[in-house]
Amino acid sequence: ELCDDDPPEIPHATFKAMAYKEGTMLNCECKRGFRRIKSGSLYMLCTGNSSHSSWDNQCQCTSSATRNTTKQVTPQPEEQKERKTTEMQSPMQPVDQASLPGHCREPPPWENEATERIYHFVVGQMVYYQCVQGYRALHRGPAESVCKMTHGKTRWTQPQLICTGEMETSQFPGEEKPQASPEGRPESETSC
């Protein structure tokens, strides 16, 4: 099931998925002056079997100049209204991101790709937050958010992160020592 919304916006922080659950869609967006090739895929889809996950479809962009049109680049699938954007920041690529079964790695960039990636996440997806450069992370708990199905609706859990304006940056998990979680109890699902 697709998540209805974007993860929470934490001031002076960005979020990123380390790996993408099967069912995640990534829009084939092209940068200004380019468009999807005719009959090209609208999106890439993370699919897989019991042993391997990968992205179906390929995104391809071509120069808008090759066609006389003022059409907007890369229309989204009609049924997808929400825009999950993560900026393309190659230094944030984690080393160990896709050993998780049922998950896809970050797709490699395609030629003339837009500067922002628009993902459509599925229930169970986890994203991690880090403070932007020049801000320091104050953790009260996990700096992550998970899309959950609760009481018939999808909802993101609250990341426990505050970014303060000090010249120190935090890292994504995998690039720092793991933090102890404030609650030591197992997760419990509510029943609605």
Epitope: P11, E82, G141, E144, Q158, E183, R185, S188, T190, S191
Partner: antibody
Framework: QVQLQESGPGLVKPSETLSLTCTVS????????WSWIRQPPGKGLEWIGY???????NYNPSLKSRVTISVDTSKNQFSLKLSSVTAADTAVYYC???????????????WGRGTLVTVSS | EIVMTQSPATLSVSPGERATLSCRAS??????LAWYQQKPGQAPRLLIY???TRATGIPARFSGSGSGTEFTLTISSLQSEDFAVYYC????????FGQGTRLEIK
């Protein structure tokens, strides 16, 4: 420091629509989910529903048919409308910051001071 | 709807003594329970969630216990500022609150 402030008419006539607004100051409305909760005089608390900055909502099933919660991110505000009110809707109405943790804990960690709404002709 | 019943309705305790407040659920809510404190004319304040986890800034004299249908909030040594109304809230199946226990000075 984030603060919440409820505002709206203190008196509403029966069968009319109760309308309240909660202003979020000192923080972004886009960082959290936000709820309305009410407390009739001398009674316990009742959760009404929540909203996210995207406009996604979830309502108490017992009030769902009469409740609409909306959000205005440009003003950092969210609002409650409760239609076809009766005397039983007389209560102190609170807005609150709504938290769901990774452990599926769901609670309200920050509240406004509340505003009394009386339903009377 | 899960009904939360708090007892006693009013509890009279002397400052410095221990106070024990009870909350019972009409069906199991696992550990999905929170406690709030409310003083006259003020908004409720979150004390405990997950039945036993203290919220940020809550003094150690407040502790929560229990699971399933029986829960307890204990205030180990009552301070003058602790006299208030206390509510429990379950979130296992939607959200419902108890009717409250008034903690008054004996």
């Amino acid at each position: 420091q984030v603060q919440l402030q409820e505002s709206g008419p203190g008196l509403v006539k029966p069968s009319e629509t109760l309308s309240l607004t909660c202003t979020v100051s000192g923080g972004s409305i886009r960082s959290y989910y936000w709820s309305w909760i009410r407390q009739p005089p001398g009674k316990g608390l009742e959760w009404i529903g929540y909203i996210y900055y995207s406009g996604s909502t979830n309502y108490n099933p017992s009030l769902k048919s009469r409740v609409t919660i909306s959000v205005d991110t440009s003003k950092n505000q969210f609002s409650l409308k409760l239609s076809s009110v009766t005397a039983a809707d007389t209560a102190v109405y609170y807005c609150a910051r709504d938290i769901l943790t990774g452990y599926s804990d769901w609670f309200f960690d920050l509240w406004g001071r509340g505003t009394l709404v009386t339903v009377s002709s | 709807e899960i009904v939360m019943t708090q007892s006693p309705a009013t509890l009279s305790v002397s400052p410095g003594e221990r106070a024990t407040l009870s909350c019972r659920a009409s069906q199991s809510v696992s550990s999905n329970l929170a406690w709030y404190q409310q003083k006259p004319g003020q908004a409720p304040r979150l004390l405990i969630y997950g039945a036993s986890t203290r919220a940020t800034g809550i003094p150690a004299r407040f502790s929560g216990s229990g699971s399933g249908t029986e829960f307890t909030l204990t205030i180990s040594s009552l301070q003058s500022e602790d006299f208030a109304v206390y509510y429990c809230q379950q979130y296992n199946n939607w959200i419902t609150f108890g009717q409250g226990t008034r903690l008054e000075i004996k």
